[in-house]
């Protein structure tokens, strides 16, 4: 009966037809599973835990970019629920490759101690 | 008297899209969903899928994901189907259709006149 | 999909006889809950189609006594006892017991 259901949806047995999983706010992630004609009883969302976050839809919570730990950079703005967190300039001590195009994460700074000669970040 | 008017003909070229209506008057078009279904000329019926008017939700038939996209006005009573990348295999009337669901009896009870699109450069 | 199968494809017929179209689904269409939702339309000429039977024996408001609807499972009949001329045009039979719902090729009722 509901072996054409989609990805994100459930079969009503109310209209006998697939339906739209609900889908999950900004900050919030799915509990539990729903999709290709079946839905859990308690399916429904829950807020992202500490240092994650959701656009919404039925995407699961990511943790947010570790802006000093892994890019070794600072922080722009800190992640929230709703939002990535943003990084700005390398930290001290560290240098980005110019023309060097963006990984998946963004900018990646390397340390100075790698520098070619008069680099400026890590100048004096 | 429960009706679903269309919008006119459409002549339309190919790799175009056009966008259709259907306004719905005389029940509560939030309390049905409105379904879409295509007749190629001379042929059979085919399910495009529906909308719930009163949340937007949407189910499309699997062939026609990315072809066709279903959506509704409430203040106006209108629901609408877009179909894009057009060619000459979506030349059909398109008809709107409600959907009766009321005590476990599934089945389509009023049928707007349907929409004529012909896709030709 | 199911896939439903009617026969004849066409039907000349004469006024006031009786007229039979068979429609086939390719799976059985009782539901979980037991229903059977086998239905039947009418595509008058130059007409959108219209309900006459629904869940395989009900005749929808207004629809004459004449028409009437049986079978189960995967085998469904549709008679009328005594053909009028505006009972003419194109016979659908379709299901919505499976998602998505589909339709028979259609039976085209026309005078001999």
């Known amino acids: 009966e509901y072996s054409n259901c989609g990805e994100n949806e459930y079969y009503n047995q109310t209209t006998g037809l697939c339906q739209e999983c609900p889908p999950c706010g900004p900050g919030e992630e799915p509990y539990l599973s729903c999709g290709y004609g079946t839905k859990d009883e308690d399916y429904g969302c829950v807020p992202c835990p500490a240092e994650k976050f959701s656009k919404g839809g039925y995407q699961i919570c990511r943790r947010h970019k570790d802006c000093e730990g892994f890019f070794r950079a600072t922080v722009l703005t800190p992640g929230d629920m709703e939002n990535d967190a943003e990084c700005g300039p390398c930290l001290p001590g560290y240098y980005m490759l110019e023309n060097r195009p963006r990984n998946i994460y963004g900018m990646v700074c390397y340390s100075c101690l790698l520098a070619p000669p008069n680099t400026k970040e890590c100048v004096g | 008297e429960v009706q679903l008017k269309k919008s006119g003909p459409e002549l339309v070229k190919p790799g175009a899209s056009v966008k259709m209506s259907c306004k719905a008057s005389?029940?509560?078009?939030?309390?049905?969903?409105m379904h879409w279904v295509k007749q190629s000329h001379g042929k059979s019926l085919e399910w495009i899928g529906y909308?719930?008017?009163?949340?937007?939700?949407?189910s499309n038939n699997q062939r026609f994901k990315g072809k066709a996209t279903l959506t509704a006005d409430k203040s106006s009573s209108t629901a609408y189907i877009q179909l894009n990348s057009l060619t000459s295999e979506d030349s059909a009337f398109y008809y709107c259709?409600?959907?009766?669901?009321?005590?476990?009896?599934?089945?389509?009870?009023?049928w707007g006149a349907g929409t004529t699109v012909t896709v030709s450069s | 999909d199911i896939v439903m199968t009617q026969s004849p494809l066409s039907l000349p017929v004469s006024l006031g006889d009786q007229a039979s179209i068979s429609c086939r689904s390719s799976?059985?269409?009782?539901?979980?809950?037991?229903?059977?939702?086998l239905h039947w339309y009418l595509q008058k000429p130059g007409q959108s189609p219209n309900l006459l039977i629904y869940?395989?024996?009900n005749r929808f408001s207004g629809v004459p006594d004449r028409f009437s609807g049986s079978g189960s499972g995967t085998d469904f009949t549709l008679k009328i006892s005594r053909v009028e001329a505006e009972d003419l045009g194109v016979y659908f039979c379709?299901?919505?017991?499976?998602?998505?719902?589909?339709f028979g090729a259609g039976t085209k009722l026309e005078l001999k």
């Open positions: 909308i719930d008017p009163y949340n937007g939700a949407t």
């Open positions: 379709s299901q919505n017991t499976h998602v998505p719902p589909t």
């Open positions: 799976q059985s269409l009782v539901h979980s809950n037991g229903n059977t939702y």
């Open positions: 869940k395989v024996s």
């Open positions: 005389g029940y509560s078009f939030t309390g049905y969903n």
């Open positions: 259709v409600r959907y009766y669901y009321g005590d476990y009896h599934w089945y389509f009870d009023v």
